[in-house]
Interface confidence: medium
């Protein structure tokens, strides 16, 4: 898991396309000492991938998450 | 420059094991999410397995779980393929490959492989 | 698992275009890369996330991706065009994440 590192987990990049919306149940926000900003979309299985916040796909899945 | 270089393939008879090892130059390697994928003579591309870039997360195919084992050491910059209970049907090209975009810890970002090593040849026979 | 059903082969003359079909249940959903492998050589990545092309990769490479199929197109097919294809895409939160396509046979009459 991301978080047993002892330094900060970051993205360095983005997935291009967005995930397929059922397979995702949750979602949290790296650092804020990243260089690069990004959401981490957590899947059924726990994979964890990195997405851009600024995409309007992830946004809309971000708030699909929070009403559901 | 990128390289991956694979070693350890050869001729083993069935029911046998091999390490396969790929070593890995150019890049920060525990970036990076590593796969190895193979293809028998004459066939297709088949993926075998799969490692996060801290080695947290590991896939496999069916068609080789339980009998192979995907591990790696960042230290080393080095991948590997425990090879266990092989069968005739193993025979063929291993590739090691890097998964493109992904990152450390075990995030994902990419998906597709953008360095491939030239392979060694696994030859399961009696 | 999912499955990538590829043409075992397409012939095209040179100057032509060449299309490699993918086909796979709603593609078009998925993230998907193409491969070039020539005889006794490995792989090399030509199409990446459906449309991107790797930096050294020629701009006679093109690729889409809608529906059920997805195409990988080769304008202006040289003779060093004539390779083995594969499609593969990444099915997130698949047991079996990676999968290729059978791979097609480009041949360059």
């Known amino acids: 898991s991301p978080y047993s590192s002892d330094t900060t987990p970051c993205c360095f990049a983005y997935i291009a396309r967005p995930l397929p919306r059922a397979h995702i149940k949750e979602y949290f926000y790296t650092s804020g000492k990243c260089s690069n900003p990004a959401v981490v979309f957590v899947t059924r299985k726990n994979r964890q991938v990195c997405a851009n916040p600024e995409k309007k796909w992830v946004r809309e899945y971000i708030n699909s998450l929070e009403m559901s | 420059e990128v390289q991956l270089l694979e070693s350890g393939g050869g001729l083993v008879q069935p029911g046998g094991s091999l390490r396969l090892s790929c070593a890995a130059s150019?890049?920060?390697?525990?970036?990076?999410?590593m796969s190895w994928v193979r293809q028998a003579p004459g066939k297709g591309l088949e993926w075998v397995s799969a490692i996060s870039g801290s080695g947290g997360s590991t896939y496999y195919a069916d068609s080789v779980k339980g009998r192979f084992t995907i591990s790696r050491d960042n230290s080393k910059n080095t991948l590997y393929l425990q090879m266990n209970s092989l069968r005739a049907e193993d025979t063929a090209v291993y590739y090691c490959a890097r998964v493109r975009g992904s990152s450390q810890y075990d995030f994902w970002s990419g998906s597709e492989f953008d360095y491939w090593g030239q392979g060694t040849m696994v030859t399961v026979s009696s | 698992s999912y499955v990538l059903t590829q043409p075992p082969s397409v012939s095209v003359a040179p100057g032509k275009t060449a299309s490699i079909s993918c086909g796979g249940d709603?593609?078009?959903?998925?993230?998907v890369h193409w491969y070039q492998q020539k005889p006794g050589q490995a792989p090399v990545l030509v199409i990446y996330y459906d449309t991107d092309r790797p930096s050294g990769i020629p701009e006679r490479f093109s690729g889409s991706n809608s529906g059920n199929t997805a195409t990988l197109s080769i304008s202006r097919v040289e003779a060093a065009d004539e390779a083995d294809y594969y499609c593969q895409v990444w099915d997130v939160d698949s047991d079996h994440p990676w999968v290729f396509g059978g791979g097609t046979k480009l041949t360059v009459l």
């Open positions: 150019g890049f920060t390697f525990s970036s990076y999410a």
């Open positions: 709603n593609i078009g959903g998925q993230n």
